[in-house]
């Protein structure tokens, strides 16, 4: 009786179970009464990452420098190229098909997590006792200056955007 199902890494065709091609190879000819499946290696800049019966290999992804992309990991016959973004940029999606400039944290906000090639800057509001007076992709919120440790007094209260202003203590005459 012809099979109705095949083992793992096989496929059913013309009532026969044929071996799939291994990763890195494409199908040329299905197996026959006389021959095993005929497979050929993928060419330069091509890949197949699964056991397959594909007659064409996939093209490696192109990391387009015009889109801010660069190669993070070169593709092989079994893996696709992995792109990442140039310094100061990050991917717009998981597939990393294009890049955007890292966002900066506005005054009053500090960097909670510095951006990577695949994730944007994460900002957080400066809590009481901290400030940021610049727009930056790297600067965290800085603590207000402690006037007391300098033997000074607060002359102007700090905000989330400004540091405190210290001044000399009033002398009793």
């Amino acid at each position: 009786e012809p099979p109705t199902a095949c083992r793992e890494k096989q496929y059913l065709i013309n009532s026969q179970c044929c071996s799939l091609c291994q990763p890195g190879q494409k199908l040329v000819s299905d197996c026959t009464e006389f021959t095993e499946t005929e497979c050929l290696p993928c060419g330069e800049s091509e890949f197949l990452d699964t056991w397959n019966r594909e007659t064409h290999c996939h093209q490696h992804k192109y990391c387009d420098p015009n889109l801010g992309l660069r190669v993070q990991q070169k593709g092989t016959s079994e893996t696709d190229t992995i792109c990442t973004c140039e310094e100061g940029w990050h991917c717009t999606s998981e597939a990393c098909e294009s890049c955007v400039l890292h966002r900066s944290c506005s005054p009053g906000f500090g960097v909670k997590q510095i951006a990577t090639g695949v994730s944007d800057t994460i900002c957080e509001p400066c809590p009481v006792g901290f400030f940021s007076n610049v727009s930056s992709a790297f600067e965290k919120c800085h603590p207000w200056t402690s006037c007391e440790t300098k033997d000074l007094v607060v002359q102007q209260a700090g905000t989330n955007k400004t540091d405190v202003v210290c001044g000399p203590q009033d002398r009793l005459r």
Partner: antibody
Framework: QVQLQESGPGLVKPSETLSITCTVS????????VYWIRQPPGKGPEWMGM???????DYSTSLKSRLTISKDTSKSQVSLKMSSLTAADTAVYYC???????WGQGTLVTVSS | ELQLTQSPLSLPVTLGQPASISCRSS???????????LHWYLQRPGQSPRLLIY???NRFSGVPDRFSGSGSGTDFTLKISRVEAEDVGVYYC?????????FGGGTKLEIK
Amino acid sequence: QVQLQESGPGLVKPSETLSITCTVSGFSLSRYSVYWIRQPPGKGPEWMGMMWGGGSTDYSTSLKSRLTISKDTSKSQVSLKMSSLTAADTAVYYCVRTDGDYWGQGTLVTVSS
Amino acid sequence: ELQLTQSPLSLPVTLGQPASISCRSSQSLASSQGNTYLHWYLQRPGQSPRLLIYKVSNRFSGVPDRFSGSGSGTDFTLKISRVEAEDVGVYYCSQSTHVPWTFGGGTKLEIK
């Protein structure tokens, strides 16, 4: 439907080179392999060699040194060339597809002066 | 080069009686992927060989079920349960596991 047809010279002189073409229809030579069989009068069949779908070739050990199999996929043709012929090469030559039971009708080649 | 040895060379059979042909290989015909590419052909007088059985025991389409194949490794058998007049001819075993592919020397079946 699937068809294979050999065309050969019929008569060849000893020491000359034999050229036979197998023209196929109903399938592509880039997806199917074809092999050559010959059968001398009153004897059993002999496998000569094959052309794989991917373009590689395999040859009979005894014929390897004087046999070349090639193909032109665009013309749907597989060619057999065999040099230094002797009377022992007189046979019916068949091209066969490597699945099912698809044979050409065969072409008789006689090697004689 | 792999040798296929068939026996007997000649097989006279009475119509309606069973027949059996043996094919022995000089090395195992099991492929690396677990398939055994041993086949049986019948060549009737004046015709090209016709495939009967492929991969040891699979009847080719249109082949009567009185033909059956069996065996493994190096020993294989073709059986005809009840011989009919149209079964006359030369039977060849053939292997396509190892390059070069090879044929057995043939067994001539004739009616007694």
